[in-house]
C-alpha cells in the first residue's frame, strides 16, 4: 500500500490557445486530469489501472501552482494504491480548459483539451522527488513525482505491513525495510521475549520482563545458579536440587547428627585431649592435675592420699609433703620404726613380722586399708566409672551410676538401642544419645519405618530428552531439569522455532 504523488509546479500557455490552436475566450481557465496505470511501452488510452485524479481550475493560461491546497484541490496530487508497487508505471497528464463550472468529462466539449503528455518508466519507492518538464509547440508543463509507502507499510515495494507496538505481543519499532527493531531489553522474532538479568542461568532461571531473573523449582540466588538443598538439611550442601550432602563431621538424612562433637563444641577443658566416641559422645583425657568428665576439676595432689601410715598431706607449689606420725618416716611415711610388738595394726588388722622383725605388714579386715589398716576403704578414689559415670560407695562394695546411653559395671559399655533391630522394612538404625533414629528405605517412613509411602518418584525415569530428575522427598514428587532446547514438566517438548513473518 502506498501513494503516487504528483506535484504540479508550473504551466506555460503564453498564447492562451487550445490544442486545436483556437484561442480560449477570454483566457484558458486550466485544470488537470491525471491517469496512472501499469507500464506500457507505448502509452495508449484505456483504464487507469493505478488510479485517476482531477484538479480544480488552477489558473489561467500561464501560472505557477502552489504547494498546498489551491481552490479546493491538493498539490501534490495523491494517487493511492493498495497493492505491491511494481516499480514501473505509465502517466498521462491532460490540461483542460473549463468554460464553465462543471468539470465533468461529459460536460466539456472534446476540443476543450489544451495539452496532453504521456510518460512511462521505472520508479523506485523513496522520499526523493523526480523533476520533469514536458514541452509541446504551444505549452510547457513542469512537475515532479515520487512513490512513498502508506503509513505502516515498508520495503522496496511497500508490501511489508509493520505496526510498532509495545505490549505483550511485541515490543518493537519498524525499520525502513519493514523488519522489526526490538526495544531495549527485548529479543526474539517478535521481540516478545525479555532479555533476563545478565548472568541469569539459562536453564534454571527465566524472566517475564527485562533484567529479571526468576528461578525454576529447586534453584535460588540472584542468578538462579544455587541449588536448594533438601528441606530440613542442617549442616549440608547440594550440587543438584533437593540434595543434602553432609559437611565434614555431620551425618544423617538431614546432616543434623554431630559426628565430630570434639571439633564443634570443644567440651574438654584445661588442655585435655578430646576423642570422638560416637554420635554426640566423646571422652576427655585429662592432663595431670585435672579430673572430671570434661577435665573441669582441678585435682589436688593430696587427693590421692599419698601419705601412708596416718601421715598427713600438705599441698605445695611443686607437689606435696607428708608429715609422718611417730614411728614412721619416708617420702610417703612408708617406712616404719615399729614392730609387731608395738601393735601397730588398727581395726582388727593382724600383724606379720618381716625382715627378721625389722619390719612388719598389717593384714587388714574387709573395708579397711592402709599400711596400719587405719583407713576405711573408699572404693571410688580411683575414679573407676567411665564415660562420666558417678561412683557411689555401698558398704563393702561400690557401684557406678551411668549417664544416659551407657551401661556396665563401670559404665564402659555404650547402650545400643539398635541391638533389638527396631527399624522395620530394612531401615538403618542409628544410636542417639537419648534413643535411636531409623533411616528408612525409599517407599517407607515413620519413626520405625513402619509406614508404607510412595516409592522414589524418579524411579520410573519420568523425564525425557536426557533431563535430570530430582525427587522432592518432602512431597514425593519429581522435578525435571530440562536440557537446553526442551520444555515441559517432563521435558518432553522441543522448543519449536516460530515460522517466519507472515507478510
Amino acid at each position: 500500500s502506498g501513494v503516487f504523488q504528483l506535484q504540479l509546479q508550473e504551466f506555460i500557455n503564453e498564447r492562451g490557445v487550445l490544442a486545436s490552436g483556437r484561442p480560449c475566450e477570454p483566457g484558458c481557465r486550466t485544470f488537470f486530469r491525471v491517469c496512472l496505470k501499469h507500464f506500457q511501452a507505448v502509452v495508449s488510452p484505456g483504464p487507469c489501472t493505478f488510479g485517476t485524479v482531477s484538479t480544480p481550475v488552477l489558473g489561467t493560461n500561464s501560472f505557477a501552482v502552489r504547494d498546498d491546497s489551491s481552490g479546493g484541490g491538493r498539490n501534490p496530487l495523491q494517487l493511492p494504491f493498495n497493492f505491491t508497487w511494481p516499480g514501473t508505471f505509465s502517466l498521462i497528464i491532460e490540461a483542460w480548459h473549463a468554460p464553465g463550472d462543471d468539470l465533468r468529462p461529459e460536460a466539456l466539449p472534446p476540443d476543450a483539451l489544451i495539452s496532453k503528455i504521456a510518460i512511462q518508466g521505472s520508479l523506485a519507492v523513496g522520499q526523493n522527488w523526480l523533476l520533469d518538464e514536458q514541452t509541446s509547440t504551444l505549452t510547457r508543463l513542469r512537475y515532479s513525482y515520487r512513490v512513498i509507502c502508506s503509513d505502516n507499510y515498508y520495503g522496496d515495494n511497500c508490501s511489508r505491513l509493520c505496526k510498532k507496538r509495545n505490549d505483550h505481543f511485541g515490543h518493537y519499532v519498524c525499520q525502513p525495510d519493514g523488519n522489526l527493531s526490538c526495544l531495549p531489553g527485548w529479543t526474539g522474532e517478535y521481540c516478545q521475549q525479555p532479555i533476563c538479568l545478565s548472568g541469569c542461568h539459562e536453564q534454571n532461571g527465566y524472566c517475564s520482563k527485562p533484567a529479571e531473573c526468576l528461578c525454576r523449582p529447586g534453584w535460588q540466588g540472584r542468578l538462579c545458579n544455587e541449588c536448594i538443598p533438601h528441606n530440613g538439611c542442617r549442616h549440608g550442601t547440594c550440587s543438584t536440587p533437593w540434595q543434602c550432602t553432609c559437611d565434614e563431621g555431620w551425618g544423617g538424612l538431614f546432616c543434623d547428627q554431630d559426628l565430630n562433637y570434639c571439633t564443634h563444641h570443644s567440651p574438654c577443658k584445661n588442655g585435655a585431649t578430646c576423642s570422638n566416641s560416637g554420635q554426640r559422645s566423646y571422652t576427655c583425657t585429662c592432663r595431670p592435675g585435672y579430673t572430671g568428665v570434661d577435665c573441669e576439676l582441678e585435682l589436688s595432689e593430696c587427693d590421692s592420699n599419698p601419705c601412708r601410715n596416718g601421715g598427713s598431706c600438705k599441698d605445695q607449689e611443686d607437689g606435696y609433703h607428708c608429715l609422718c606420725p611417730p614411728g614412721y618416716y619416708g617420702l610417703h611415711c612408708e617406712h616404719s620404726t615399729l614392730s609387731c610388738a608395738d601393735s601397730p595394726c588398727f581395726n582388727g588388722g593382724s600383724c606379720r613380722e618381716r625382715n627378721q622383725g625389722a619390719n612388719y605388714a598389717c593384714e587388714c579386715p574387709p573395708n579397711f586399708t592402709g599400711s596400719n589398716c587405719e583407713k576405711k576403704v573408699d572404693r571410688c578414689t580411683s575414679n573407676p566409672c567411665a564415660n562420666g559415670g558417678q561412683c557411689l560407695n555401698r558398704g563393702p562394695s561400690r557401684m557406678c551410676r551411668c549417664r544416659p546411653g551407657f551401661t556396665g559395671t563401670y559404665c564402659e559399655l555404650h547402650v545400643s538401642d539398635c541391638a533389638r533391630n527396631p527399624c522395620a522394612h530394612g531401615g538403618t538404625c542409628h544410636d542417639l544419645e537419648n534413643g535411636l533414629m531409623c533411616t528408612c528405605p525409599a517407599g517407607f517412613s515413620g519413626r520405625r519405618c513402619e509406614v508404607r509411602t510412595s516409592i522414589d518418584a524418579c524411579a520410573s525415569s519420568p523425564c525425557f530428552n536426557r533431563a535430570t530428575c530430582y525427587t522432592d522427598l518432602s512431597t514425593d514428587t519429581f522435578v525435571c531439569n530440562c536440557p537446553y532446547g526442551f520444555v515441559g514438566s517432563r521435558c518432553e517438548f522441543p522448543v519449536g522455532l516460530p515460522p517466519s513473518f507472515p507478510w
Partner: antibody
Framework: EVQLQESGPGLVKPSETLSLTCTVS??????????WGWIRQPPGKGLEWIGD???????YYNPSLKSRVTISVDTSKNQFSLKLSSVTAADTAVYYC?????????????WGQGTLVTVSS | SYELTQPPSVSVSPGQTASITCSGE??????VSWYQQKPGQSPVLVIY???ERPSGIPERFSGSNSGDTATLTISGTQAMDEADYYC?????????FGSGTKVT
Amino acid sequence: EVQLQESGPGLVKPSETLSLTCTVSGGSINSGNYYWGWIRQPPGKGLEWIGDISYTGSTYYNPSLKSRVTISVDTSKNQFSLKLSSVTAADTAVYYCAREDVMYGGGGDSWGQGTLVTVSS
Amino acid sequence: SYELTQPPSVSVSPGQTASITCSGEGLGDKYVSWYQQKPGQSPVLVIYEDSERPSGIPERFSGSNSGDTATLTISGTQAMDEADYYCQAWDSEAGVFGSGTKVT
C-alpha cells in the same frame, strides 16, 4: 491440532468466587509464542476480553475487571485457570478460553467450546 | 477506556459484497483481528493483522485498516456466511472487542 476445554461449576452463588479451568491438549502450554486467555459472552450480548497469561505466569487483565480477576497457569498439568471473585448476576455468561498467537498479532486462533456459568442464589 | 464501534447489522444478497466497518481512535496504527461467530458456536478467527487469513479461511474474506476504520469485506457472500462478526484490537496490554455486527 491444539484443543482447549473449559471445566468448572455451572452455577455460582452471588458474592462467591467463580472458578474455571482450561485444559490444553494436542500441544504444550510451554511456549513463548502463545498467551492463554479468557473471554466471556453474556447471553445475547457481545464478547468481552477478561485477561490472559503466559506460560511463565505473566498476567494481563481487563482494567474493568482487574480487582476481581486472578488467572494462573499450571504447566505440569497443561492447564490455566480463572478465578472471578464477588460475582453478581451481571457475571452470568458463557466463558471461553482461547489461545492468542503472537505470530497472529495476538489473534485468538483456537477457542474452547465455552461453558455457561449462571450466577444465582 | 478504548472502544471499537461496529454497525449492529448489515444485510446483503447472496453473491453480493458485504462490508463491515470497525472504528476506533487511531485504529489504523493497531493490528485488527476479525472473528465469525455462528449461533451456539465458539468464535472463529477469519482475519488477523488487518488483512491476513488463517489457513482454512476462504479467499472471499478480506480485510483492510487505515485511519480510524478497519473493514472486513465478504465478496460473493454465501448463505453460510450469515453470522455475528466481531473486530478486536489490543490497546496497551488489554484486548478490546467491537460491539459486533449481525450479517444477514
